[in-house]
Amino acid sequence: NECPELQPPVHGKIEPSQAKYFFKDQVLVSCDTGYKVLKDNVEMDTFQIECLKDGTWSNKIPTCKIVDCRAPGELEHGLITFSTRNNLTTYKSEIKYSCQEPYYKMLNNNTGIYTCSAQGVWMNKVLGRSLPTCLPECGQPSRSLPSLVKRIIGGRNAEPGLFPWQALIVVEDTSRVPNDKWFGSGALLSASWILTAAHVLRSQRRDTTVIPVSKEHVTVYLGLHDVRDKSGAVNSSAARVVLHPDFNIQNYNHDIALVQLQEPVPLGPHVMPVCLPRLEPEGPAPHMLGLVAGWGISNPNVTVDEIISSGTRTLSDVLQYVKLPVVPHAECKTSYESRSGNYSVTENMFCAGYYEGGKDTCLGDSGGAFVIFDDLSQRWVVQGLVSWGGPEECGSKQVYGVYTKVSNYVDWVWEQMGLPQSVVEPQVER
């Protein structure tokens, strides 16, 4: 009743290792690190066999099979490259995840390198088995914005791709008679979120209640250049419309809102997010130059009454932009306080424009981003949103445009997007 000598499997061992095995002796077959016991097509960690009364083993010696991590998981907005020849996915093989540059970057500058572990899972030194995250790159247009623009009043045509964050927001309330239709601008913050002014998305009521328009009435166009040709643009419906809870319709304080898109939009040379600023109550410094784009009125002699009577005919077909300096807060406050009417330039606003006029944003540009180039990060940052202006014609002398100071709302924006400030990397480094 002595059993035959045993040969350990390739890449494996048998324990205990004895010269002779007799009835009732048991042997445990195991494999080297990175290999699994394979018996009858079933993978296991160990396998036990016993020497039987008749001098035979209870089972054949199993084989040791190299661990296979199989095809790695797909990475949204990312690519996988195999570092090992023949695209091997077995133990100790290596793969590298990367993001679709230049539109996405890897969160926390992760290496993206994963190794097939002995347990059969792809492992990263920092993230473990979790996949990396590809975040949209922000504030880096595929076309460089010109360093100087003389004088979307007094503005000029924008080349396609100059303002890849620019969104056209169309609100159409078909439930009203006659149909209500208006539009504004917005700025893409991520593949799923648009930042705009609250007054663009407030339901047009006669009272002072602040109720958002129904999401069904909102369409957002991205990658749009000429409003007459929407074929190359991405259009999306809204999943959520969020007005800042403190928005005040009487003085336009807290004039900020967000639209969550029904589906994330694909990023590309004409569709890219703008960066959010740091949380700082000061906002942009006086005299800093910013750019604003929009499809609003580009004729300086058009009055608000004429626009209302002529519908959208006075709007620009092609996206316009203008370069404007930030006006010292006290100067702007004074210029509005000296006017008849109850104008309030609050701490949540800043002004931009020229004392002599001639360059300004106007009706229809509402919600558009006032962007400033951040020298540190070399990115464009949304510091303002087109909010309101004086009763005179757009571009009038000493009538500055008033913008929502975005830096006061960074926390609220991140929260709504599900990424509160405390846990996200600031998009613009100090």
Epitope: V242, L243, P245, Q260, T346, N408, D411, W412, G418
Partner: antibody
Framework: QVQLKQSGAELVKPGASVKMSCKAS????????IEWMKQNHGKSLEWIGN????????KYNEKFKGKATLTVEKSSSTVYLELSRLPSADSAIYYC?????????????WGQGTLVTVSS | DIVMTQSQKFMSTSVGDRVNVTCKAS??????VAWYQQKPGQSPKALIY???YRYSGVPDRFTGSGSGTDFTLTISNVHSEDLAEYFC?????????FGSGTKLEIK
């Protein structure tokens, strides 16, 4: 550190008015609105309204319009809540609170509460 | 007004247990929900904001989850000092509203 110190307990007669205070310290007073909540004995919290010391903006819950009035004394960094025409149902603890972020209305800092008892 | 419903007025648990406190909003409030803890005779204290983010100094046994209309506060490994009432609050729109509260009792 941020502190909100509320005035002491009040015993008032039905139909009368009461004015309580909330003195803020440890931060720039004009940067954040002050919120007010009511909590009946053993009950939940109700948001009454808020007051922004920077520009005097106030917002009220419809339920408390005409009942609650919010005012400020900037020199002492104090916001006041005045409640008028008090019935016994207004017996409650009244809390003032401050947001963590100025633009995001959840309340990280709370006063110790002012107990108001309406009884004849 | 948005109604925040905390269906369980009381919850009984033992030290070391895991407990889920739930809150339902009458309409979509996105992630704008906060959770507060109130111990007898004390003011409320913020635990969670933006549905799932712990406020500084809050022990990591407290976690929040949910978005839209359904929200949960989970206390894993309940401590005796967690005996308190827990309130949810929406701050998506005015008037800000609170749930009716859930009292946690330790067996």
């Amino acid at each position: 550190q941020v502190q909100l110190k509320q005035s002491g307990a009040e015993l008032v007669k039905p139909g009368a008015s009461v004015k309580m205070s909330c003195k803020a310290s440890g931060y720039t007073f004009t940067t954040y609105p002050i919120e007010w909540m009511k909590q009946n004995h053993g009950k939940s919290l109700e948001w009454i309204g808020n007051f922004h010391p920077y520009n005097g903006d106030s917002k009220y819950n419809e339920k408390f319009k005409g009942k609650a009035t919010l005012t400020v004394e900037k020199s002492s960094s104090t916001v006041y809540l005045e409640l008028s025409r008090l019935p016994s149902a207004d017996s409650a603890i009244y809390y003032c609170a401050r947001r963590h972020y100025a633009a995001s209305p959840w309340f990280a800092h709370w006063g110790q509460g002012t107990l108001v008892t309406v009884s004849s | 007004d948005i109604v925040m419903t905390q269906s369980q007025k009381f919850m009984s648990t033992s030290v070391g247990d895991r407990v889920n406190v739930t809150c339902k909003a009458s309409q979509n409030v996105g992630p704008t929900v906060a959770w507060y803890q109130q111990k007898p005779g004390q003011s409320p204290k913020a635990l969670i904001y933006s549905a799932s983010y712990r406020y500084s100094g809050v022990p990591d046994r407290f976690t929040g989850s949910g978005s839209g209309t359904d929200f949960t506060l989970t206390i894993s490994n309940v401590h005796s000092e967690d005996l308190a009432e827990y309130f949810c609050q929406q701050y998506n729109s005015y008037p800000f509203t609170f749930g009716s509260g859930t009292k946690l009792e330790i067996k």
